[in-house]
Amino acid sequence: MNGRVDYLVTEEEINLTRGPSGLGFNIVGGTDQQYVSNDSGIYVSRIKENGAAALDGRLQEGDKILSVNGQDLKNLLHQDAVDLFRNAGYAVSLRVQHRLQVQNGPIGHRGEGDPSG
């Protein structure tokens, strides 16, 4: 029997300092480029090696970025989101949502970390 896959969603505030080559990551998403079904949010698609984000270590590929310097990223065109990051200044505050996949045991078996029972 297959285990069921659950997700643990957490939010975090990440403060990055723009490095010589910038913030060091790529994004996908936006109202004109939905990456997740029925969600026009902005997601991290790539963390560049030795960039500011990689050196900080907290931002992960697959994270959803909720806001930049307090500005909500909802309902933005893809390029408008890109421009927001590019114009965000030297010190950049990101509100991000991490989505951690949790593999539970097969039905009938209480896996580690399963609070039920």
Epitope: N26, V28, Q33, S45, K48, R86
Partner: nanobody
């Protein structure tokens, strides 16, 4: 991550044309910015052309401007490089490259570091 396979290379006479194709596997192709680079024997890798995820923006190296045209078909997961008025100095191995998503930093399509996925290359020889 997509995998990239180039095709369409070959031997052509000066003044002739070729169309290179780069086929991508995977369902995320439409999120990729795509580029073409080339490398001639004993020379450094050279930027040829690039195209944005939507196809709205295109970029060309100085040596191919006005002769080469990049395009993409997101329904077919393919990017094309139409090469016209070919010259012997266009002889090289041509590589397709992809960048997943848009950089939030200043974009330089000619910088190989922008790209995270590369094809194996296809030989173009102009005699």
């Amino acid at each position: 991550q997509v995998q990239l396979v180039e095709s369409g290379g070959g031997l052509v006479q000066a003044g002739g044309s070729l169309r290179l194709s780069c086929a991508a596997s995977g369902r995320t192709f439409r999120y990729y910015s795509m580029g073409w680079f080339r490398q001639a024997p004993g020379k450094e890798r050279e930027f040829v052309s690039a195209i944005s995820w939507s196809g709205d923006s295109t970029y060309y190296g100085d040596s191919v401007k006005g002769r080469f045209t990049i395009s993409r078909d997101n329904a077919k997961n393919t990017v094309y490089l139409q090469m016209d008025s070919l010259k012997p100095e266009d002889t090289a191995v041509y590589y397709c490259a992809g960048a997943f998503g848009s950089t939030v930093d200043n974009y330089d399509p000619s910088d190989p570091r922008e790209y995270d996925t590369w094809g194996q290359g296809t030989q173009v020889t102009v005699s």
